[in-house]
Interface confidence: low
Amino acid sequence: EVEKTACPSGKKAREIDESLIFYKKWELEACVDAALLATQMDRVNAIPFTYEQLDVLKHKLDELYPQGYPESVIQHLGYLFLKMSPEDIRKWNVTSLETLKALLEVNKGHEMSPQVATLIDRFVKGRGQLDKDTLDTLTAFYPGYLCSLSPEELSSVPPSSIWAVRPQDLDTCDPRQLDVLYPKARLAFQNMNGSEYFVKIQSFLGGAPTEDLKALSQQNVSMDLATFMKLRTDAVLPLTVAEVQKLLGPHVEGLKAEERHRPVRDWILRQRQDDLDTLGLGLQG
């Protein structure tokens, strides 16, 4: 903690400007008024303060706002945000999406940090749910965001938000997460025509039940093997050979290469050999 010392004559800061970079830590503590700092936070990021100087500025704000910073200050924290601990952030009440964006921008390109995770907690708790604008923002900054949520958290995602999701955003989702997302996607894309619908729903099919796969098999969708291999085993097992052939179209030949892997292996074992032989792939049940 910085010792309380009187500000030298003529050094009292009248505004937050570049001259302050030449102040020693104790001079910043003594000569910069915390209220002035709070009203001119937007200027701090334009000034090349050292990390040690930023520590002093943070200390001044902490003294001024022991219960947590107001949003007017939070929105302009800029690089000072990187100095905040999760404990600091838990005191905040962040409600503006602009504030969230401003702070995510500071952390852009870095891994998700405990600070950012805590910030997102505060924001989503304040809003009561993951609305579309929030989800759009979070997936823009953190593409894998959806797959980082538990199925319980995903249940609060409104179907309208699914439009923002790109296939690569679902790469790390596990089956239980897709179980929650798939019905939302189905609802979101329900008014699209067949081929467009399949393009949109394809990434979510790891959560699809058997009856939906049967329906898709009637629509000449030509599902690729990569998508087929991500389907739920329990959803694939009841499909007939004819239905799988229709579902995969020209990609059906790829079953041979995957015959030892789930769900193909388990599906093959459930079929009659006569039916498998109709595919002409040499699959053995």
Epitope: R90, T118, L149, E152
Partner: nanobody
Framework: QVQLQESGGGLVQAGGSLSLSCAAS????????KAWFRQAPGKEREFVAS????????AYADSVKGRFTVSRTYAKNTVYLQMNSLKPEDTAVYYC?????????????????WGQGTQVTVSS
């Protein structure tokens, strides 16, 4: 209401290992198990480990870092604590805690539901 049930405690020799698990049941839509605390006889309850952010982000007490590993599975809504290289000073009742949120935290005030605890005894 969320119910938390810990299991896996027991008696183990110093240097040994134990694996604790905590399963959540009840209305778990928003709350899920994400932390372990412990309380030794005559001492305050202390933070051990926490997991958040889809299992990618974890936090540990300094005293257990490198020896304990916290993990989580969605399918069973369960949080685990793998404890290796156990020491006599790890002897305590271990409690599982559930809360909302994606950031791991050592702050017990952030957790809304607690399990009954499971006894871990490490003999020298």
């Amino acid at each position: 209401q969320v119910q938390l049930q810990e299991s896996g405690g027991g008696l183990v020799q110093a240097g040994g290992s134990l694996s604790l698990s905590c399963a959540a049941s009840g209305h778990t839509d928003s709350y899920y198990p994400k932390a372990w605390f412990r309380q030794a006889p005559g001492k305050e309850r202390e933070f051990v480990a926490s997991i958040g952010w889809g299992g990618r982000m974890t936090a540990y007490a300094d005293s257990v870092k490198g020896r304990f590993t916290v993990s989580r599975t969605y399918a069973k809504n369960t949080v685990y604590l793998q404890m290796n290289s156990l020491k006599p000073e790890d002897t305590a009742v271990y409690y599982c805690a559930a809360g909302i949120g994606w950031a791991p935290t050592a702050d017990s005030g952030e957790y809304d539901y607690w399990g009954q605890g499971t006894q871990v005894t490490v003999s020298s």
